[in-house]
Amino acid sequence: AGVFELQIHSFGPGPGPGAPRSPCSARGPCRLFFRVCLKPGLSEEAAESPCALGAALSARGPVYTEQPEAPAPDLPLPNGLLQVPFRDAWPGTFSLIIETWREELGDQIGGPAWSLLARVTRRRRLAAGGPWARDIQRAGAWELRFSYRARCELPAVGTACTRLCRPRSAPSRCGPGLRPCAPLEDECEAPPVCRAGCSLEHGFCEQPGECRCLEGWTGPLCMVPVSTSSCLGLRGPSSTTTGCLVPGPGPCDGNPCANGGSCSETPGSFECTCPRGFYGLRCEVSGVTCADGPCFNGGLCVGGADPDSAYICHCPPGFQGSNCEKRVDRCSLQPCRNGGLCLDLGHALRCRCRAGFAGPRCEHDLDDCAGRACANGGTCVEGGGAHRCSCALGFGGRNCRERADPCAARPCAHGGRCYAHFSGLVCACAPGYMGARCEFPVHPDGVSALPAAPPGLRPGDPQRAGVIAVIVVVVIAIVAGIVVLVISRKKRMAKYEKAEIKEMGEMHRELNA
C-alpha cells in the first residue's frame, strides 16, 4: 500500500502567439480544479476507461476574474497535494492523466457549468520511494508544470511497496537521566537467521547467529525481562549486558492512532484499526467519503458497497463522471435531425425544428404546405422547408388574401378594353386586333400574322359566352380540388402541429425557469 502524490506548480497560457488570456469564458469569473487518474501499464488507454490505480480530485481553486489590461498570469490554483492511495503493489509503469477543469460560476439548473480545459496524458516509469519527478507538459495552448512521486506506507517498503517491514522497537521515550534512544531502522521480511532459540518476540539479529534484545529484555536468547532495579543508568541495550534502558511507555500509551483509530499492541510495536475513510499506519491518511461532499452538480453520494470504494456518486441528468463533474454534451451527438437546433436544458434535451419538420427529434417531415393553405384558390408551391403561394388571378400577397385589380396594370394592348372578372380578366379588343391581350394585329384579308395563335374574342363573338362558361367551370373545379386537398392535409398534420406548439411552450417555460 502507498500513496501517489501530485503537486501542481503552475497552470497557465503556454509560450508563443495565440495563447489564451483567460481560462474563463465570456460568461464571467471561473475557477480551476484538477483531476488525476492513474492507470497501470504503459498502454494508451481511453481517458474514460476506469482509473484502475485510483483517481483524485483537487479542491477548487480561488475565483479568477480576468483583468482586462493585465498580462495573462499563472492562474490561481487549489492548495495542497493531490493524493491517490493505492492498496496493492505499485506497478512501476503507469499512465498519468491530469485534467484541468473549469468551473464557470453561475446559477444554472443542475449546478455550475463545468468544462474540461486541458488534459495531459503521460506514460511513465517510477519507483516508489524515489524523489519527486518534475515535468512540464503542454495541452493545446496551455502549459502545466507539476511534480509527482509514489511513496509506500508502513509497513510496506521497497520500489513496489511489496516488502513488509515492522519497526525493530516500539516507539519509546527515554526516562529521566537516561540518554536519548538511538534511532532504529526497520527490520524487513526475510531477516537473517538468528541464534537458535532467540526469542521471536523480544530478540532480533543483524548478522546470522546473533541474538540482540529489544528494550526491556535480556539474556542470551532475550527471554529474561529486565528488572528496573538492576538497570545500569546510561548503558545501552546489548546482548552481553544485563543493564538496559528503562522500558518506555507501552506502544499504545497515548493512543498513536489518529482520527478515532483504535490501538492494539503487537510484539514490539502497535497496530491501528482505522475507522471507515481513514488508513495508514496511524490512520493519519484520510479517504474521501460522502461526508466530504465529493459529488458535484447535485449528485447524490452513496457509501460504497465494499471498503475499497468509499463512495459512489449518482449523477443528475446531464452530468457524468465519477464525481458528476462532467457536463454531458448531448448535443454533440447531433440528435436533432433535418437541421433542427439542439437545446440542452441540463435536465432535458429539446430540439427546435426548422419549418416543415416536427417531432421530438424533428424526425417527421411535414408537407411544407400542410396547414398553410393559400386563400382564394391559390396553389401552394413547396421548396426547401419553406412555401409560397401561386395566387389565382385577381388575388395577391403571401397567402393570396389580398384582392388585386387585374386591370390596374393595363394588360390589354392596342387600346383593348379590360374587364375584371372573378376568374381573371377579359380583353375586349379594338377592331383589327385579337388575342388574349389583343396583342396580335388582324390582316385585312382576315389572316392573322401568327396563324397558329388562337383568334381573339371580340365583344359580340358568338363563341364568347360559351368559352367564358367553360373557363368558369374549369376554375371552380380546380379551386374545389385544392380546398379538399388542403383540408385533408390540415387534418393529417394537426396532431404534429399541436404537439410542436405544446413542446415549444414547455421549452420556453423551462428555459425561463
Epitope: E103, D107, I109, G110, A291, G293, G298, C301, P317
Partner: antibody
C-alpha cells in the same frame, strides 16, 4: 453521523415574520446544497427553497408560493442554513424540515420545527 | 409545475404481502423520481432515487420501477416496520414536487 437540527419555529400572527435556523454536523457542510421542505396536513410535503454553494454564488431557488416572502441563506463557518419568513399567511403553517440537499433526492432530514400562523 | 399524483391515499395490507404503491407524473420526467418513507412522528427518509436505486441501508425488499410518467414502489414481504406514509418526488425540474402520499395500514 449526519445530524441536522432546526430551531426558531413557533406561533406567529398573519403578516408577521420569523427566522428558522438549522445547524448541521457530521459532514462537510460547505460542499452540500441545503434545502427547506415543509409539511402540512392540507398540502402534504412541499419543497420551499434551496441554496447552493459559495462557488455558485450561493444561488437560491424558491417555490412560487413563497417567492418574494421567504429568503434562504447560509453561513458555512457556522455550518448553518437559515430561512427568513416574512409576510406570513395561514397557509404557511406546517412543520419545516431542513434537508441536506442535492438534485437526486434529499438524503438527510432534520427533526423539523413547527410554524403556526394564526390570529 | 409537474404534478405528482398518488391516487391511493390509503392501502390496506397484511404482513408478508407484496404491496405496490403507484405515482403518476403530469409530464415526462424520465427516471428522475425518488421515494421517501415517513413513519408516524418522524421525518421522511430517502428510500429510492433515480426510480430504482436503493439508498444506503434500505432493505432489498424495497424496489422501484417505471419511467416517463408512471412509477411504482414495491415492497415484497411486507414487515410491520414498513407501516408508514410513502411519498414520491420528481427532480426533473424546478419546482421540485412531491406526491400527496400513500399510507400503508394493516387490514
Amino acid at each position: 453521523e449526519v445530524n441536522l437540527e432546526e430551531s426558531g419555529g413557533g406561533l406567529v400572527q398573519p403578516g408577521g415574520s420569523m427566522k428558522l435556523s438549522c445547524v448541521a454536523s457530521g459532514f462537510a457542510f460547505s460542499n452540500f446544497w441545503m434545502q427547506w421542505v415543509r409539511q402540512s396536513p392540507e398540502k402534504g410535503l412541499e419543497w420551499v427553497a434551496q441554496i447552493r454553494l459559495k462557488s455558485d454564488n450561493y444561488a437560491a431557488h424558491y417555490a412560487e408560493s413563497v417567492k418574494g416572502r421567504f429568503t434562504i441563506s447560509r453561513d458555512d463557518s457556522k455550518s448553518s442554513v437559515y430561512l427568513q419568513l416574512n409576510n406570513l399567511r395561514a397557509e404557511d403553517t406546517g412543520t419545516y424540515y431542513c434537508t441536506q440537499g442535492n438534485w437526486v433526492g434529499f438524503a438527510y432530514w432534520g427533526q423539523g420545527t413547527l410554524v403556526t400562523v394564526s390570529a | 409545475d409537474i404534478v405528482m399524483t398518488q391516487s391511493q391515499k390509503f392501502m390496506s395490507t397484511t404482513i408478508g404481502d407484496r404491496v405496490s404503491i403507484t405515482c403518476k407524473a403530469s409530464q415526462n420526467v424520465g427516471t428522475t423520481v425518488a421515494w421517501y418513507q415517513q413513519k408516524p412522528g418522524q421525518s421522511p427518509n430517502l428510500l429510492l432515487y433515480s426510480t430504482s436505486n436503493r439508498f444506503t441501508g434500505v432493505p432489498d425488499r424495497f424496489t422501484g420501477s417505471g419511467s416517463g410518467t408512471d412509477f411504482t414502489l414495491t415492497i415484497t414481504n411486507m414487515q410491520s416496520e414498513d407501516l408508514a406514509d410513502y411519498f414520491c418526488q420528481q427532480y426533473n425540474n424546478y419546482p421540485l414536487t412531491f406526491g400527496g402520499g400513500t399510507k400503508l395500514e394493516i387490514k
